[in-house]
């Protein structure tokens, strides 16, 4: 990028540059029209018969350098060929010299600084590549010369450019003074400011564009070269903030439109709001959940919104004495989540009718809550009680919802209490083929014992076909048809109106080896 300090083509008034000395044959200002018919000013000099050592100087006005360290001067000029000038002497030249002089203010006068090299700094002696030829009575023909010179390094507030003629016949058609700067650049969402290079290369720190944030790592920088070009190098730049996406060739961050969101900074574009959410404003980093829908604390910001599940369905209960097996079907609506668990609430009502939350004597297997499978076994039910179980389905957002949690209830009434297990079995008599057993009558809480069931099998014969049962109304029994000298395992349970109690502990008994021993009482 070039920044103009002076362009005579654009000047709308007389240039009125200073000449020295005040003699005939000096530089003179002329006006004409450029290709666009705009008025332009030029300077001419043609003192080809000058006295030896006589120089004609032309000095521009003071030009503020505006921070430039190196300034470029593009000269457009024509130069008349000395051979075309019939009165040209040996002093005719086809070159001119360019100088500059620095100062902190417009302090030069008609006589100062002294019109000579030092204090003026010589830039170059300029020779014409193209010479203009002129024949008497005819128009001059020849190409315009274009020469760009480099001034500097400059350090003061401004400078003057000066042209020294020592016998040329020439026209200075235009002068363009400019400096080079790196234009403002936006790349990878990083803005690098317009920079005037002060050295061969200058590092320039970038800043993130609006609504962008720095990427991790070193802060982005580019190098501005002396020629006004940015040195190519990868830029670890910035990325659009949450709620914004890169646009216009990675030069801007654009707010996410309504109905879209972007949860994180970085690459990637705005996405439509996930299920059951919406964004009513632009620039959303997160979409708001619809009423009744939620995100769990652990859900990503871009996750769909979910709702608590509906109640479990079809609870099936199987009561077995003091234990209960409950089983149910998954809810119709999972709420859009996979972290489904179940929990149970329990109330118990005594035979007399007073109800309360279940006591601590109940056990739940695997537990009363955080169940992942749709079943539970409840143990320790008390006889002749009515239990109400409420089975609820829960998920990761159930705790966020207000209002009652839907449940599926099931009522279970336990039987009156069965007799306790029969223990203390003793063998009253044994023979090679029979065993006589007796036991204490258990204390049945709900009425008398109606009868007993004896369950026995030979030790080592564990299959169902080897187990035999015997019913007896007395608290004794005789087992017949047994094997000689064999061991038997015996269990007894009692039955009352409430039903059978549990079998007692296994009792170990043995038949006699032969008859000669006769009947023998055995105490268990």
């Amino acid at each position: 990028l070039e920044e103009t300090l002076l362009n005579t083509k654009l000047e709308t008034a007389d240039l009125k540059w200073v000449t020295f000395p005040q003699v005939d044959g000096q530089w003179e200002e002329l006006s004409g029209l450029d290709e666009e018919q705009h008025s332009v000013r030029t300077y001419e000099v043609c003192d080809v018969q000058r006295a030896p050592g006589q120089a004609h100087w032309l000095r521009t006005g003071w030009v503020p350098r505006r921070g430039a360290v190196h300034v470029y001067a593009t000269l457009r000029f024509t130069m008349l060929e000395c051979l075309s000038l019939p009165r040209a002497g040996r002093s005719c030249k086809e070159t001119f010299t360019v100088f500059y002089y620095e100062s902190d203010a417009d302090t030069a006068t008609a006589l100062t600084p002294a019109w000579m090299e030092n204090p003026y700094i010589k830039v170059d002696t300029v020779a014409a590549e193209h010479l203009t030829r002129k024949r008497p009575g005819a128009e001059a023909t020849g190409k315009v010369n274009v020469k760009t010179l480099r001034l500097g390094p400059l350090s003061k507030a401004g400078f003057y450019l000066a042209f020294q003629d020592q016998g040329a016949c020439m026209a200075l058609l235009s002068l363009h003074l400019f400096y080079k700067k790196c234009a403002q650049l936006t790349v990878n969402l990083t803005r690098f400011p317009e920079t005037v290079p002060r050295e061969l290369v200058v590092p320039v720190a970038g800043s993130c564009v609006v609504d962008a944030v720095p990427a991790p790592g070193p802060s982005p920088s580019l190098y501005c070269r002396e020629d006004g070009q940015w040195a190519e190098q990868p830029v670890t730049g910035c990325s659009c903030a949450p709620g914004f996406e890169a646009a216009e060739g990675n030069t801007k961050c654009r707010a996410c439109a309504q109905g879209t969101f972007k949860p994180l900074s970085g690459e990637g574009s705005c996405q439509p709001c996930p299920a059951n959410s919406h964004s009513n404003t632009i620039g959303s980093a997160v979409c708001q959940c619809r009423v009744g829908y939620f995100r769990a604390r652990t859900d990503p910001r871009g996750a769909p919104c979910t709702t608590p599940p509906s109640a479990p369905r079809s609870v099936v209960s199987r009561l077995n004495g003091s234990s209960l097996h409950l089983e149910w079907s998954a809810p119709l609506e999972s709420g859009g989540r996979e972290d489904l668990t179940y929990a149970l609430r329990c109330r118990e009502c005594r035979p007399g009718g007073s109800c309360a939350p279940c006591g601590g004597d109940l056990t739940f297997d695997p537990g009363p809550r955080d169940l992942v499978e749709p079943w539970v076994v409840v143990r320790g039910l008390r006889p002749d009680f009515t239990y109400t179980f409420e089975v609820t389905a829960l998920n990761g957002v159930s705790s966020l919802a207000t209002g009652p949690v839907p449940f599926e209830p099931v009522n279970v009434t336990t039987d009156r209490e069965v007799p306790p297990a029969v223990s203390d079995i003793r063998v009253t008599r044994s023979s090679p083929s029979s065993l006589s057993l007796a036991w204490a009558v258990p204390r049945a809480p709900s009425g008398a014992v109606l009868d007993y069931e004896v369950k026995y099998h030979e030790k080592g014969a564990e299959g169902p076909s080897s187990v035999r049962f015997l019913k007896t109304s007395e608290n004794r029994a005789e087992l017949r048809g047994l094997k000689r000298g064999a061991s038997y395992l015996v269990q007894v349970r009692a039955r009352s109106e409430a039903g059978y109690g549990p079998f007692g502990q296994e009792h170990h008994s043995q038949t006699q080896l032969d008859e000669s021993e006769g009947w023998r009482e055995q105490l268990a």
Partner: antibody, heavy 128, light 108 residues
Framework: QVQLVESGGGLVQPGGSLRLSCAAS????????MSWVRQAPGKGLEWVST??????????FYAAPVKGRFTISRDNSKNTLYLQMNSLRAEDTAVYYC???????????????????WGQGTLVTVSS | DIELTQPPSVSVAPGQTARISCSGD??????VHWYQQKPGQAPVLVIY???KRPSGIPERFSGSNSGNTATLTISGTQAEDEADYYC???????????FGGGTKLTVL
């Protein structure tokens, strides 16, 4: 000898037309930017029009009071400058001078801003 | 556009210095030229580019221009210098020329 000689002046009625001529000699006419300047009786000088040197289609410039009524032109083969005056008004009564602008050494695209050569003038009277 | 203002008349004794002014807004930024016109004659250029003298013009004629005023100075005025003097400059449109109203110099 370097000179400019105007002709074509005279008495003309308001609304009438007149064509002034200026014959140049002693210099390269086709390298010179030429102008007309007038002077009403007892008044000061007033620039009228300028034509640049290059032909054909040289650029022309006019003072506001005459724009659209006067036309400047030149015939380089005859070394002559013209001013065609139409729709003449009483206020156009003046001595009309042909004047040369300072010339470039060799580039007729440019001229100096002063008039360095003048003709003796021709009187134009617009009256009924 | 710029307007150039001159005093209608200036009187000077022979041999004295006559100064004729020409004023206009920021005139010092423009080149000013001076013309001499004697009765019944065409104008003659006496000063151009503020202070330059054409060949054939006596050295007693000089010019300056700064600020809002340009000045034509005639040192050691002679009777033959009695004439009307006009200043001129470009207008802002550059190719248009404006003249001052003229100053009648009387040599007493």
């Amino acid at each position: 000898q370097v000179q400019l000689v105007e002709s074509g002046g005279g008495l003309v009625q308001p609304g009438g037309s007149l064509r002034l001529s200026c014959a140049a000699s002693g210099f390269t006419f086709n390298n010179a930017w030429m102008s007309w300047v007038r002077q009403a009786p007892g008044k000061g000088l007033e620039w009228v029009s300028t034509i640049e040197a290059k032909m054909p289609n040289g650029a022309t410039f006019y003072a506001a009071p005459v724009k659209g009524r006067f036309t400047i032109s030149r015939d380089n083969s005859k070394n002559t400058l013209y001013l065609q005056m139409n729709s003449l008004r009483a206020e156009d009564t003046a001595v009309y001078y042909c004047a040369r602008k300072g010339m470039s050494f060799y580039n007729n695209k440019y001229a100096k801003s002063m008039f360095d050569l003048w003709g003796q003038g021709t009187l134009v009277t617009v009256s009924s | 556009d710029i307007e150039l203002t001159q005093p209608p008349s200036v009187s000077v004794a022979p041999g004295q210095t006559a100064r004729i002014s020409c004023s206009g807004d920021n005139l010092g930024k423009k080149y000013v030229h001076w013309y001499q016109q004697k009765p019944g004659q065409a104008p003659v250029l006496v000063i151009y580019y503020d202070s330059k003298r054409p060949s054939g013009i006596p050295e007693r004629f000089s010019g300056s221009n700064s600020g809002n005023t340009a000045t034509l100075t005639i040192s050691g005025t002679q009777a033959e210098d009695e004439a009307d003097y006009y200043c001129s400059a470009w207008t802002t449109t550059m190719m248009h020329i404006v003249f001052g109203g003229g100053t009648k110099l009387t040599v007493l």
